[in-house]
Interface confidence: low
């Protein structure tokens, strides 16, 4: 037999096995030219000392053979024996160490077997009712196709599905959409109508999210404030990364999954905006506010489930950096400066009802006074911080005040309200003996003592009424007693005890009297 | 005026540490993040992490993760940057960057240090 | 990683001309984009930060704009000073990442 023909005859070696694991697989015949045909295959196992024969049988029963060699791919013409225009049957059988092993059968019109290509360029991903709809251009001159799609998932198997005839300039596939993992794809075409003509080359992989994107598992760390008012937010954790089946794990566009960090500022209502998205891998800068961070997940498909932490507000406070100046015009707040054009948001709350909603009020931009300082001032009828208790204040500033991630805090303080001198007298103030010449005062605490660091000291005085001397006894704000000592017996005395906070002396309290009796001896 | 003054150039061995240093002066050390970024011999510019000097937090390039420490001395104003296990395509010159207030973008750099790795 | 790239690589003018070099991030910054200039064997010196906003010091001569993914620097009246080589950046996302580079030469 000539080489470029099909051989009439048996050919060299004993009959096939096709029983097994190894040996010729996927075996495709298409035109290629006008009088031009080719047939290619897969060998799995061993090559060395195979030799394959592509075996082909005419409508008639009449077989014949082509010799191959070691070679995978043969290409004939019109001429070499196989009839083009009838149905024809091949398939390919491997001779190799004493026996034989043969693929599975095609039968086909080799003349209408045209080599179609797979789906090309673009594939379009969307959802449709809960499906998944995937859409391409139709490859050129390749109108009416049968389309095939495979599919697989990190942990499963590839697993095959149909499309459908299609016979449009675009094509489509519904396929199924997994919930909770990701998927790749792929896609084949043949030609519509032709049974035994041979499959494309599967499509490169279209890699598709889990409709659901993952709950983003991350933990933040806040750093301290520091002196510019500022705390960086920091990852400690990243998104665990999604798990990819094998053709995803490259560059592969389309699975991402992205990540947004919104920032929302709870302190200061009164401000231009309270919230902001930004990527998470820009970590912001924060004031000392309190905020809510939420990280949301989204992928091709849309947004999916977030997760929330709450920041709490920086406690500490600054020791006195705001002076209030209360006059018969009104209240006046100062407090070191920041740059020019800087807008100040005040915001104060009753201290033990943190729940409620802050007074909050937004400066102008300011430039700082001569002296430096920072100020807002309001009236007396606003009746702001006007009840007799204890207030936070918080000040925060921005050159920006639009742009949320650039607010600092400026400090954060306490302040009794009202006429703190007269509601910051201590009450209850009782005397007991304590020796033969001295006695122990006691009082209750001043409702100063209820705002940290504003009750300086309390002064006890103690006047003779004999001589009109009188002293006067410094005691740690902590402390609710003080002994005083070096007293004359049988000599009246009247104590009185004040609270003083930095910038205001306190309103003694009611005279107490009091003398140690003369002991008389026996 | 602001200024960020470096160490002076280092030879060192493949595998061995390198340890630059950056003072400040002319501003409150401790109020703004210090950022190194380094420059390979003709080549372009590459970012390698910052340091808050008001508390040692650090953040370093994933590149870099492992290899490199920043700290800080406070009361001297100085930050430092070592790179270990070095290679010789580590040969650069390393500069510090000052990150400005209000926006992480950077204002003011140091003279640069060359480390040169060769055995 | 945000690439950027910066074009053209390399360009002559005269002293006196306009120039504009362009820088391109391969995903959308905002405005998080600043501009250096580093003359041979020197630091590089801050130009432009927040894409359009001048450093203090730097003459007005010096200029940006742009936002998301493109960028571009311009320098009127060229000074021999200015001859240089310009690098972009990104300080939006970690790693802060640098453009390659555009050499500014006397023609």
């Known amino acids: 037999c000539r080489t470029s023909e099909c051989c009439f005859q048996d050919p060299p070696y004993s009959d096939a096995d096709s029983g097994s694991a190894s040996g010729p697989r996927d075996l495709s015949c298409y035109r290629i030219s006008s009088a031009g045909y080719e047939c290619s295959w897969q060998y799995e196992g061993p090559t060395a000392g195979v030799s394959h024969f592509l075996r082909c049988c005419l409508s008639s029963g009449r077989c014949c053979y082509f010799a191959t060699g070691s070679a995978t791919r043969l290409q004939f013409s019109d001429q070499a024996g196989v009839s083009v225009l009838h149905t024809v049957t091949l398939w390919v059988e491997s001779w190799a160490r004493n026996r034989t092993e043969k693929s599975p059968e095609v039968t086909l019109q080799l003349y209408k077997s045209v080599k179609y290509k797979p789906p090309l360029g673009d594939i379009k991903v969307s959802k449709l009712a809960g499906q998944l709809r995937m859409e391409w251009e139709t490859p050129d001159n390749q109108v009416g196709a049968e389309v095939q799609f495979r599919h697989r998932t990190p942990s499963s198997s590839w697993k095959l599905g149909d499309c459908g005839p299609q016979d449009d300039d675009t094509e489509s596939c519904l396929c199924p959409l997994e919930m909770n993992v990701a998927q790749e794809f792929q896609l084949r075409r043949r030609r519509l109508g032709s049974q035994g003509s041979s499959w494309s080359k599967w499509s490169s992989p279209v890699c598709v999210p889990p409709e659901n994107p993952p709950q983003p598992q991350v933990r933040f760390s806040v750093e301290q404030l520091g002196r510019d008012g500022r705390r960086r937010l920091t990852l400690k954790e990243q998104p665990t990364q999604l798990e990819l089946p094998e053709g995803c794990q490259g560059p592969a566009p389309g699975v991402e999954v992205t990540y947004q960090l919104q920032l929302h500022m709870l302190s200061c209502p009164c401000k231009a905006k309270a919230t902001r998205t930004l990527p998470l891998e820009k970590m912001p800068y924060l004031s000392g506010a309190a905020y809510n961070v939420a990280v949301i997940s989204s992928n091709r498909f849309g947004p999916g489930p977030n997760q929330t932490w709450h920041i709490p507000a920086d406690t500490h406070t600054e020791p006195v950096a705001l002076n209030i100046s209360v006059g018969t015009n009104g209240t006046t707040m100062y407090w070191p400066a920041r740059a020019q054009s800087t807008t100040y948001c005040i915001e104060w709350q009753p201290v033990g009802q943190e729940g409620s909603l802050a007074t909050c009020n937004l400066t102008a931009p300011q430039d700082p006074d001569p002296a430096g300082m920072a100020t807002y001032s309001w009236s007396r009828e606003s009746g702001a911080m006007g009840q007799e208790k204890c207030y936070h204040i918080t000040i925060f500033a921005s050159a920006h005040p639009k742009k949320l991630t650039l607010w600092s805090t400026v400090l954060s303080t306490y302040h009794f309200g009202g006429n703190a001198s007269a509601a910051g007298t201590p009450h209850h103030v009782s005397v007991k003996n304590h020796s033969l010449d001295s006695v122990s005062v006691d009082w209750a605490p001043s409702l100063l003592s209820t705002c940290p660091g504003v009750l300086k000291e309390y002064v006890v005085r103690c006047r003779d009424e004999d001589s009109n001397q009188v002293s006067e006894h410094p005691v740690q704000p902590t402390e609710t007693q003080v002994t005083l000592s070096d007293l004359r017996a049988g000599v009246a005395y009247t104590v009185q005890v004040r609270a003083d906070t930095a910038w205001l002396r306190g309103a003694w309290s009611q005279p107490q009297r009091f003398s140690i009796k003369v002991q008389v001896s026996d | 005026q602001v200024q960020l003054v470096q160490s002076g150039a280092e030879v060192k061995k493949p595998g061995a540490s390198a340890k630059v240093s950056c003072k400040a002066s002319g501003y409150t050390f401790t109020d703004y993040y210090l950022h190194w970024v380094r420059q390979a011999p003709g080549q372009g510019l590459e970012w390698m992490g910052w340091?808050?000097?008001?508390?040692?937090?650090?953040h370093y390039a994933q590149k870099f993760q492992g290899r490199v420490t920043m700290t800080r001395d406070t009361s001297i104003s100085t930050a430092y940057m070592e790179l270990s296990r070095l290679r010789s395509d580590d040969t650069a010159v390393y500069y510090c960057?000052?990150?400005?207030?209000?926006?992480?973008?950077?204002?003011?750099w140091g003279q640069g240090t060359l480390v040169t790795v060769s055995s | 990683d945000i690439q950027m790239t910066q074009s053209p690589s390399s360009l002559s003018a005269s002293v006196g001309d306009r120039v504009t070099i362009t820088c391109r991030a391969s995903q959308g910054i905002g405005n998080y984009l600043a501009w250096f200039q580093q003359r041979p064997g020197k630091a590089p010196k801050s130009l432009i930060y927040a894409a359009s906003s001048l450093q203090s010091g730097v003459p007005s001569k010096f200029s940006g704009s742009g936002s998301g993914t493109d960028f571009t620097l311009t320098i009127s009246s060229l000074q021999p000073a200015d001859f240089a080589i310009y690098y972009c950046q990104q300080y939006n996302i970690y790693p802060y990442t640098f453009g390659p580079g555009t050499r500014l030469e006397i023609k």
């Open positions: 960057a000052r990150e400005m207030g209000g926006t992480t973008a950077f204002d003011y």
């Open positions: 340091i808050n000097p008001n508390n040692g937090g650090t």
